[in-house]
């Protein structure tokens, strides 16, 4: 028998989403206008390509990366697209209100779209921990809260700690990971009897997840360099990210084989670990002076990722109810922390080199920045989790977790589609 949306959600979701969309359209109408000063059309196209790379990463990369569940692949891809589309709209407005609004209208530039796409990417990283256990109405709430929290975090960090766009956006890895994990912690955990098969991966969805990983792998240098100020910084970021992800692929595949008693390679490990270098190198990608350092970082990140994928899922599954294949959350939390630690080391070296007696102060500031990102992620994540538990959202019953048939109309009703 085909599973239907509960009647109340069938009324609630379109009403909730379309009302929100109408509100966003009104906000855009009253408060925004385009940057009218674009003189150079060739330059415009070149600048747009960076945004295009980010959109490909978000829609195809993260969309397909989370689609490895046997019975939840459609929902993973489409819900990701839905969240991206909504998240970008709200992020553009929010960023404009927080940074430009006192001067009048919010000016929309390609740069603001770039920032918004990256903010929305945060939600797509976080949602990996809860996908399959929530419906679209709940995901709308998650998008709104997370984009708002990240926008405010970036504003606070920018004003208090004087960090540039790149540095305060690179907290996205740690922020998104901890946000997602704390939301997952709030949601009902036990998978009832008979649903265990649904959170298992299947060959075709796993292949599409690998496709997602490949897209992310190809475009990660664009992500790490998108917000950098000068061509030399972007060049360094692209090169260092490329070296790091290249090494993490080799490490992921060989490490995965090493971790298996029969020397077999785990798809789940590879999906996530191929990206490890890109995450770990993110914060300092433009500062690393030579390729070998980026490669070492990629190697360490790959090993941490494979190690984490081997030993953490049991714990995460028990405590947070996160399925074995959703390893992005704890992966990004570990690798994001590694990246932040690398940056703090660079900061210490810099301060010592300058003969500045303020080493402790600088390190304290950086640790404060990181701590603030984690605290805001955890607090806003817990708030979101509590909101998602409200009855009004008509969350899927636990027996319907990881089931496309709850959300999609299929021409056939075969269970093993």
């Amino acid at each position: 028998m085909s599973s239907k949306y509960p009647r109340s959600v069938r009324r609630c979701l379109p009403l909730w989403a379309l009302t929100l969309e109408a509100a966003l359209i009104l906000l855009f109408y009253f408060f925004t206008h385009y940057d009218a000063s674009l003189e150079d059309q060739k330059g415009l196209v070149a600048s747009y390509q960076v945004g295009q790379d980010l959109t490909v990463m978000a829609a195809i990369g993260l969309g397909f990366l989370t689609s490895s569940f046997r019975r939840h692949s459609w929902s993973s891809v489409a819900f990701n697209l839905f969240m991206l589309a909504l998240g970008v709209q709200w992020a553009i407005l929010l960023d404009g209100f927080l940074s430009q609004f006192p001067s009048g209208k919010v000016v929309i530039t390609l740069f603001s779209i770039r920032l918004a796409t990256m903010s929305a990417l945060s939600v797509l990283i976080s949602v990996d921990a809860v996908l399959g256990k929530v419906n679209l109405a709940q995901l709308v709430v998650m998008v709104l809260v997370e984009v708002t929290a990240l926008g405010n975090l970036r504003m606070v960090i920018s004003n208090i700690f004087n960090t540039d766009y790149h540095m305060n956006m690179m907290h996205i890895y740690v922020f998104a990971a901890y946000f997602g994990l704390s939301v997952a912690w709030c949601l009902p955990k036990p998978l009832p009897e008979g649903t265990e098969d649904k959170d298992q991966t299947a060959t075709i969805p796993s292949l599409s997840a690998m496709l997602g990983a490949l897209f992310l792998w190809m475009f990660w240098p664009s992500f790490n360099s998108a917000l950098l100020r000068s061509p030399i910084e972007r060049k360094n970021a692209v090169f260092n990210t490329y070296y790091a992800v290249a090494v993490s692929v080799v490490t992921a595949i060989s490490g995965s084989s090493l971790a298996h008693p029969q020397g077999k390679i785990s798809k789940t490990y590879v999906h996530s670990a191929v990206l490890a270098g890109g995450v770990a190198v993110g914060t300092s990608c433009h500062l690393i002076p030579s390729p070998w350092l980026a490669m070492v970082l990629g190697l360490v990140a790959g090993l941490i990722s494979v190690g984490g994928a081997k030993y953490l899922p049991g714990c995460c599954n028990r405590v947070l109810g996160i399925p074995h294949s959703s390893i992005m959350g704890y992966n990004f939390s570990l690798l994001g922390l590694l990246g932040e630690i690398i940056y703090i080391v660079l900061l210490v070296l810099d301060t010592v080199g300058a003969g500045n007696g303020m080493i402790g102060f600088q390190v304290l500031l950086s640790i404060g920045e990181l701590s603030l990102a984690i605290v805001i992620a955890l607090m806003s994540g817990l708030l979101t989790g509590l909101l998602l538990n409200l009855k009004i959202w008509k969350a899927p019953h636990e027996a319907k977790y990881f089931d496309d048939q709850v959300f999609w109309k299929f021409p056939h009703l075969a269970v093993g589609f």
């Epitope: 674009l38 003189e39 150079d40 330059g43 415009l44 070149a46 600048s47 960076v50 530039t109 390609l110 740069f111 770039r114 004087n162 540039d164 766009y165 540095m167 100020r229 000068s230 061509p231 030399i232 910084e233 360094n236 300092s284 433009h286 500062l287 002076p289 940056y343 660079l346 900061l347 070296l349 810099d350 301060t351 080199g353 300058a354 500045n356 303020m358 102060f361 600088q362």
Partner: antibody, heavy 125, light 105 residues
Framework: QVKLLESGGGVVQPGGSLRLSCVAS????????MHWVRQAPGKGLEWVAF????????GYVDSVKGRFTISRDNSKNTLYLQMKSLRAEDTAVYYC??????????????????WGKGTTVTVSS | VMTQSPFSLSASVGDRVTITCRAS??????LSWYQQKPGTAPKLLIY???RLQSGVPSRFSGSGSGTDFTLTISTLQPEDFATYYC?????????FGQGTKLEIK
Amino acid sequence: QVKLLESGGGVVQPGGSLRLSCVASGFTFRSYGMHWVRQAPGKGLEWVAFIWFDGSNKGYVDSVKGRFTISRDNSKNTLYLQMKSLRAEDTAVYYCAREKALRGISRYNYYLDVWGKGTTVTVSS
Amino acid sequence: VMTQSPFSLSASVGDRVTITCRASQNIRSFLSWYQQKPGTAPKLLIYAASRLQSGVPSRFSGSGSGTDFTLTISTLQPEDFATYYCQQSYSAPWTFGQGTKLEIK
């Protein structure tokens, strides 16, 4: 050699508009961030606006936000400053300047290494 | 806020001159020094607090980090009489000091 040449200055009434241009030569214009800095008569230097090398990001001092717009045309090696709703306090010599980046260990350091000769803007009724 | 001292300074050719610049917050080494002569554009002397711009005579030197910075001219030459500005690029908006006018005694 590396040169920046401003033009477009003049006398304008309060509330009027003016568009300044800065033509670059002797270097790869599209690879550098650019700035406008002004100096009121008998006063010090005041930073006004910046634009990234690819034109994707811009920033302004609070006193000109919403009135001034910085832009660039990399195909013409030209930087612009569109000034609207001009006030008496906008009277100054306007300089364009090139931004250079130096890699530090934990952050890049930016500075203005090449300046134009300046163009004078007078806002008076 | 960048505060320069002194506001003006009289010195003779051959003197050693020191101009100081104080930042209202820690700006690490994100400081530049410029020289401006009447009717001309500013000229970069020192960047990153202590690095000498190419083409600038070695009698100019910069030092400091954090909040206190100094520009030193070891042996004053006739062409050095001008106004000197410090400028921070640590946080937006970039700000300049009010300037120090160096005059002939």
